[in-house]
Amino acid sequence: LRQEDFPPRIVEHPSDLIVSKGEPATLNCKAEGRPTPTIEWYKGGERVETDKDDPRSHRMLLPSGSLFFLRIVHGRKSRPDEGVYVCVARNYLGEAVSHNASLEVAILRDDFRQNPSDVMVAVGEPAVMECQPPRGHPEPTISWKKDGSPLDDKDERITIRGGKLMITYTRKSDAGKYVCVGTNMVGERESEVAELTVLE
């Protein structure tokens, strides 16, 4: 034991992340110690493989100790990057473990669970269109477009609640092509077009 040697301590802990599938990401970790500690990452108790183990890996252990993802990998069934991570710094005097950091993957599927259907109503009658956006995380918000332009939801006759678009009292000018839009941090998806026909 050399007098100036000291055990590792974490000086920068990783933070929780939410990242879009396919995007790069970094979980930061910085440790001090003498001799300079080695850093390893663990997810759910298993050591995380990096480019140090397999040159083809999409995860790189940076010289600083941070874990860099070239792209976040996340499929319908396989989700190797999502989870709770810790970094562990070690030297011959001991080890230090960082705080937990969760990496969540933001996704937005392509397929609408329910596309809106064509509706035909008489002037003055209520009209309802319904859609269920694609599955997503974070849960996608829903908006509507009419004839390619965002719907004016300041119109007191129009209510958007969940996936339902309700027009309490239809006018002839409400007729047109409606599209449901699901949006989250990944982007947006548009449903199939539904036609609202307003009869005199």
Epitope: G44, E49, H74, G75, R76, K77, G83
Partner: antibody, heavy 118, light 105 residues
Framework: EVQLVQSGAEVKKPGASVKVSCKAS????????MHWVRQAPGQGLEWMGW????????KFPQKFQGRVTMTRDTSITTAYMDLSRLRSDDTAVYYC???????????WGQGTMVTVSS | DIVMTQSPSSLSASVGDRVTITCRAS??????LNWYQQKPGKAPKLLIY???SLQYGVPSRFSGSGSGTDFTLTISSLQPEDFATYYC???????FGGGTKVEIK
């Protein structure tokens, strides 16, 4: 190196069961779905189902429900496929395959030949 | 169940030829379509994932296209090592096409 290594060839009698193992190495076993695919002599590929190694949850096509069991042991990073009430038309090469995060089977085992004969 | 129909079931071609194999899904599968190559006595090998993305280490003469229900695998200039059987697979709910055997003319 990422690889899947399967157990050796088996010869079974009709009505018996067979258990094929698939040892995974070089990657985080719990992060990737594991599928089983079989191929009868001279025929195409037939999907048998998959297991989520994290949870142990399984899914099979209707054809194999009630006859196939898929399990895993995360402590030894090994997946298992058990097929019961064997018939002669179950004679095939059985493969395990890892499903990548891109929804494709990127790593395959070498295959296990199962012969069912009286 | 989603049925994958591959055509042709076999074809004869010469080295240097451009080869096209098609795969049709019985319902829309977006881009959840993969292509594999299999040689006798060997496990299948992933060539193309997500309809058009080339798997790491696969030669660029292989390409994939399509979306929805109709998909194509193209080998721009057939090489001697490309004589094999090719399978499409949909990963929306998982099933394989019947295969296309590419033989030497």
């Amino acid at each position: 190196e990422v690889q899947l290594v399967q157990s050796g060839a088996e010869v079974k009698k009709p009505g018996a069961s067979v258990k094929v193992s698939c040892k995974a190495s070089g990657y985080t076993f719990r992060g990737y779905a594991m599928h089983w695919v079989r191929q009868a002599p001279g025929q195409g590929l037939e999907w048998m189902g998959w297991i989520d190694p994290r949870t142990g949850l399984t899914k099979f096509p209707q054809k194999f429900q009630g006859r196939v069991t898929m399990t895993r042991d995360t402590s030894i990073t090994t997946a298992y496929m058990d097929l019961s009430r064997l018939r002669s038309d179950d004679t095939a090469v059985y493969y395990c395959a890892r499903e990548s995060g891109d929804d494709a089977f990127d790593i395959w085992g070498q295959g296990t030949m199962v012969t069912v004969s009286s | 169940d989603i049925v994958m129909t591959q055509s042709p079931s076999s074809l004869s071609a010469s080295v240097g030829d451009r080869v096209t194999i098609t795969c049709r899904a019985s319902q829309k599968i977006s881009s959840y379509l993969n292509w594999y190559q299999q040689k006798p006595g060997k496990a299948p090998k992933l060539l193309i994932y997500a309809a058009s993305s080339l798997q790491y280490g696969v030669p660029s003469r292989f390409s994939g296209s399509g979306s929805g229900t109709d998909f194509t695998l193209t080998i721009s200039s057939l090489q001697p090592e490309d004589f094999a059987t090719y399978y499409c697979q949909q990963s929306y709910s998982t099933s394989f096409g019947g295969g296309t055997k590419v033989e030497i003319k």
